[in-house]
């Protein structure tokens, strides 16, 4: 039949009926059956008569927002095919499962900006295939465990922002299809471990503007598909790896406007796919070496509006994919004015912004490692000088932002204008001279080259550098640094240790007129370090500053030493040959002392030559294997470090059983001759020698002579009775050894029967 006309109080467009903002207190009675989208928003409806929806078979979208409903209405027969129901900005206080049971096709339900105070597990029954549920801007204080379980098969988006939720129960959401969860602007203080387990498909989690101060280990466990995590405007003071455990697919992490003061080096090990990390508006004061090293996929790092004053060399090591680094509004002037190597590792960086960092000068190597940089923003810094070469290696630089009216237009700046023009980089450079007076207010591009002169040196110039030194623990030391300047501008002095300013430095500053040139002032600063400890070790540098800029000295290293002292000293030992000698020696000191051994004052000794010497560094033990008599002597252990050396001695006594050096041989002599028997014995202790003839001790006559050590027996005027078996007995504490010699005595010399001569 013919299409039914539009309802009297409404306007029509296609299959949409707009009855919004008409001040209606009840449904229009003539709703056409062809209606697919019905707008009843901005009226005064406090209840809905289900009968009014009896003949609306095509109805899919119902807008009832901004009315005065106090409960989820029934739409009668239409309930079963309504797909989207908008009930925001009413006065609904609770949601009952019974009210929703009839909505068999409902996919979008907006209940935001109502007066709902709690969500119980009876609120959302199984049945309605809700994909998007908006509960934002209510007064929800508690979420009952399993409150949304009835929607587990369908829910994709859940908005709970702007409520009063203070706590999330562990495993609060069993919604395996959910991709977006919005918990902005609640009152959550703590995220417990496993809170979000059950959200296997979650991609975006919004937790900004809560009061979260702690993320317990495993807080986000189970969110293995999550790409974006918003934690802005909370009270976090740190990020540790445990709290990020399980975020293996995370691409964006927003942590701005917290109170994070430190980045832990191992804090990022579980989110190595991170592409963007936002840490702006926190309390960071330093970036330590390799503190972000695990973020090899990071593309954007935003660190603006912190108080970063120290960037360690190698702080960005590992960030090989980083393209954008935002360091605006920090205090990293020192990094740009002096340090080199702060940006090493940023091989892919194309944009670096350093707006508003109180940078007064740009050092030659400030940007070393950033050869691929395309965009560099140094605006908002009262730059006075830029050293030659500072930007030169950036062959791809397309945009350089400088805005300063503080330039010291002297000979050292002369290179800059033509270089900027030649590289076509002057478009974003507003650079005006402040000095000398004759050029004040002129653009550096309009100053003729011959006007960039160095008639004086306004910026301080270091003339005495602090010197590397070594000190013993407990001693007082001092570093001296002097600078000269032709300016009468007040001079300030600072000392840095390992690139960080020493806040309570004990320094002595003085000034005098330079002898050679009456107009030049020489400024000296002395840093006193009293009773130094190991904690004083490091690299010290002075920074001398006046209105025209800062000058940085070389870095002088302080090494604090302690003389070696023995913890184990070698003891005198007495051992037998062929056994193992063991000498102990250990010492402490700073630096760790080296231990060296000597024998009798030399380093070339038998055990060393014959590879029988073994030093066990970890055991502090020195071994000599298969000990020989030659190994006996005085062994010295020397412990040496750069502070000095100490020695300790031990005597090695080698005991040896007696033995003959030269064999004792049988002898034949004639009567009247002299015979000598030698018992040349060795052993330690030296053996006592006793002579026997036969089985009895030798009876000595005036013809028998013994050397004092009994080693040589001489018998003169041999007689026949001297013949026999002579025994040399060698004895010491280790044992006794015997050697024999048969002495044969022939008659006096004369002719034998066979014609041979006797003798």
């Amino acid at each position: 039949g013919p299409r039914a006309p539009c309802a009297a109080a409404c306007t029509c467009a296609g299959d949409s009926l707009d009855c919004g903002g008409r001040g209606l207190a009840a449904l229009p009675g003539d709703l056409p059956s062809w209606t697919r989208s019905l707008n009843l928003s901005y009226n005064k409806l406090s209840e809905i008569d289900p009968a009014g929806f009896e003949d609306l078979p095509n109805l899919q979208e119902v807008y009832l927002n901004n009315n005065e409903l106090t409960a989820v209405p029934s739409l009668g027969a239409a309930s079963s095919h309504v797909v989207s129901l908008f009930l925001q900005h009413n006065k609904i206080r609770s949601v009952e499962g019974s009210q929703l049971k009839a909505y068999l096709s409902l996919e979008v339900l907006d209940l935001s900006l109502n007066n709902i105070t709690e969500v119980r597990n009876t609120c959302f029954p199984h049945g309605p295939p809700i994909k998007e549920l908006n509960l934002a801007g209510n007064r929800i204080g508690t979420l009952e465990l399993g409150a949304f379980d009835g929607l587990s098969r369908s829910l994709l988006t859940l908005r709970l922002s702007k409520n009063r939720i203070t706590q999330l129960p562990v495993r609060a959401f069993k919604l395996p299809r959910l991709t977006q969860l919005d918990l902005n602007r609640n009152r959550i203080r703590l995220i417990e471990g496993l809170t979000f387990q059950g959200l296997n498909s979650l991609e975006v989690l919004k937790l900004q503007r809560n009061n979260i101060s702690k993320l317990t280990d495993g807080a986000f466990w189970g969110l293995s598909k999550m790409h974006v995590l918003h934690l802005e405007y909370n009270s976090l003071v740190e990020v540790n790896s445990g709290s990020l455990y399980g975020l293996t697919a995370l691409h964006q992490l927003h942590l701005s406007n917290n109170s994070i003061a430190r980045i832990h080096r191992k804090g990022w090990s579980f989110c190595q796919k991170l592409h963007e990390l936002v840490l702006s508006f926190n309390n960071l004061t330093r970036l330590d070496e390799e503190s972000l090293a695990e973020l090899s996929s990071l593309s954007v790092l935003r660190l603006s509006h912190n108080s970063i004053s120290h960037i360690a060399e190698g702080a960005f090591k590992g960030l090989r994919s980083l393209r954008v680094l935002d360091l605006d509004h920090n205090e990293i002037s020192g990094t740009i004015e002096d340090t080199s190597g702060a940006f090493s590792g940023l091989d892919s960086l194309s944009k670096l912004t350093l707006f508003g960092n109180k940078i007064k000068s740009v050092a030659k190597r400030a940007f070393s490692g950033l050869e691929g940089l395309e965009h560099l923003n140094l605006g908002g810094n009262a730059i006075r000088s830029v050293q030659f070469d500072a930007f030169v290696k950036m062959k791809n630089l397309k945009e350089l932002h400088i805005s300063s009216d503080s330039f010291l237009c002297d000979c050292q700046l002369k290179w800059l204008p033509p270089w900027l023009i030649g590289r076509m980089l002057q478009a974003f450079v507003t650079a005006t001279c402040a000095h000398p007076e004759s050029l004040k207010g002129q653009s550096i591009f309009s100053v003729p080259p011959e006007s960039f002169v160095c008639d004086d040196f306004l910026k301080p110039q270091i003339i005495t550098q602090p010197e590397t030194t070594m000190a013993m623990v407990g001693k007082d030391i001092r570093f001296t640094c002097s600078a000269a300047s032709s300016s009468s501008s007040p001079m300030t002095f600072a000392w840095k240790k390992d690139n960080e300013v020493l806040t309570n430095a004990d320094m002595e500053n003085f000034v005098h007129v330079h002898a050679q040139d009456g107009e030049v002032m020489e400024y000296t600063t002395i840093l006193h370090l009293r009773q130094v400890t190991f904690g004083h070790e490091g690299r010290y540098q002075c920074v001398i500053t006046n209105h025209f800029g800062s000058t940085y000295s070389h870095k002088a290293r302080l090494t604090v030493n302690v003389l070696p002292s023995f913890t184990k000293t070698p003891h005198d030992i007495t051992i037998r040959t062929t056994t193992v000698a063991r000498l102990e020696c250990a010492a402490t000191g700073h630096p760790n002392p080296q231990i060296a051994w000597q024998k009798d004052g030399g380093t070339d000794f038998p055990a060393a030559r014959e590879r029988r010497m073994h030093v066990m560094p970890d055991d502090d033990v020195f071994f000599i294997t298969d000990v020989k008599i030659d190994d006996a002597g005085v062994y010295s252990c020397t412990a040496q470090n750069s502070a000095g050396s100490i020695s300790a001695n031990a005597t090695l006594t080698v005991l040896e059983t007696p033995s003959l050096v030269v064999p004792l041989e049988d002898r034949v002599v004639s009567v009247g001759e002299t015979v000598a028997l030698q018992c040349k014995a060795t052993g330690n202790p030296p053996p006592r020698i006793t002579w026997f003839k036969g089985d009895r001790p030798l009876s000595l006559t005036e013809r028998h002579h013994l050397t004092p050590d009994n080693q040589l027996l001489v018998v003169q005027n041999v007689v026949a009775e001297d013949a026999g078996r002579y025994t040399c007995e060698m004895s010491n504490t280790l044992g006794t050894e015997r050697a024999h010699s048969q002495l044969s005595v022939l008659p006096a010399a004369g002719c034998r029967k066979d014609g041979t001569t006797v003798g």
């Epitope: 030659f388 050292q412 002369k414 290179w415 023009i421 030649g422 080259p449 011959e450 160095c454």
Partner: antibody, heavy 121, light 111 residues
Framework: EVQLLESGGGLVQPGGSLRLSCAAS????????MSWVRQAPGKGLEWVSG????????YYADSVKGRFTISRDNSKNTLYLQMNSLRAEDTAVYYC??????????????WGQGTLVTVSS | QSVLTQPPSASGTPGQRVTISCTGS????????VSWYQQLPGTAPKLLIY???QRPSGVPDRFSGSKSGTSASLAISGLRSEDEADYYC???????????FGGGTKLTVLR
């Protein structure tokens, strides 16, 4: 009056070494960039190396990189050029030159009289 | 082959005006000031012009320098016999990170 006096030139065999010195006077040596420039017999000028005053940053021509080392001793007002692994093509008069100011891109406003280095076997 | 290109020779009669050109690129002349050096036979070079067009004290105003884009030129007016010398242009090259000279121009004053 600015004066630059080179010394240390002479005959050396290929592969050998030589150290040139340049004694400066008449100006505050420690404030200026200094360079070595050479001129082969009958040829044009070739910049060899330069050194900055403050941090002693060094710069080298590709032809000498890795073989020559420039240094300065501000306390002695002296510039040096250590030349190793010398080649026949290093034969030239070596001039010591003072930069107009402290930056490497400044012109050379004073030159020494030069010292001859001959590399030949 | 020099980075800066100069004509190998130039000549003129006394009183004439002679111009010597020097051509480079954006990494040298295009980004830097140009200098000119005069080397009289058997002597060390001498700075003649710096900062494109500035004369050190003692250099006659017959010598003048100019620059446009990546080219520079030295003009000598009122040519004199004592001007017979080799002339070199020079500047810093940011690509090579070093100072570069032209190949030199031998100026002959014809009698």
């Amino acid at each position: 009056e600015v004066q630059l006096l080179e010394s240390g030139g002479g005959l050396v065999q290929p592969g050998g070494s030589l150290r040139l010195s340049c004694a400066a006077s008449g100006f505050t040596f420690s404030n200026y960039y200094m360079s070595w420039v050479r001129q082969a017999p009958g040829k044009g000028l070739e910049w060899v190396s330069g050194i900055s005053p403050g941090d002693s940053s060094t710069y080298y021509a590709d032809s000498v990189k890795g073989r020559f080392t420039i240094s300065r001793d501000n306390s002695k007002n002296t510039l040096y050029l250590q030349m190793n692994s010398l080649r026949a093509e290093d034969t030239a008069v070596y001039y010591c030159a003072k930069g107009l100011y402290s930056n490497p891109n400044e012109p050379f406003d004073y030159w020494g009289q030069g010292t001859l280095v001959t590399v030949s076997s | 082959q020099s980075v800066l290109t100069q004509p190998p020779s130039a000549s003129g009669t006394p009183g004439q005006r002679v111009t010597i050109s020097c051509t480079g690129s954006s990494s040298n002349i295009g980004s830097n000031y140009v200098s000119w050096y005069q080397q009289l036979p058997g002597t060390a070079p001498k700075l003649l012009i710096y900062d494109d067009s500035q004369r050190p004290s003692g250099v006659p105003d017959r010598f003048s320098g100019s620059k446009s884009g990546t080219s520079a030129s030295l003009a000598i007016s009122g040519l004199r016999s004592e001007d017979e010398a080799d002339y070199y242009c020079g500047t810093w090259d940011y690509s090579l990170n070093g100072y570069v000279f032209g190949g030199g121009t031998k100026l002959t004053v014809l009698r």
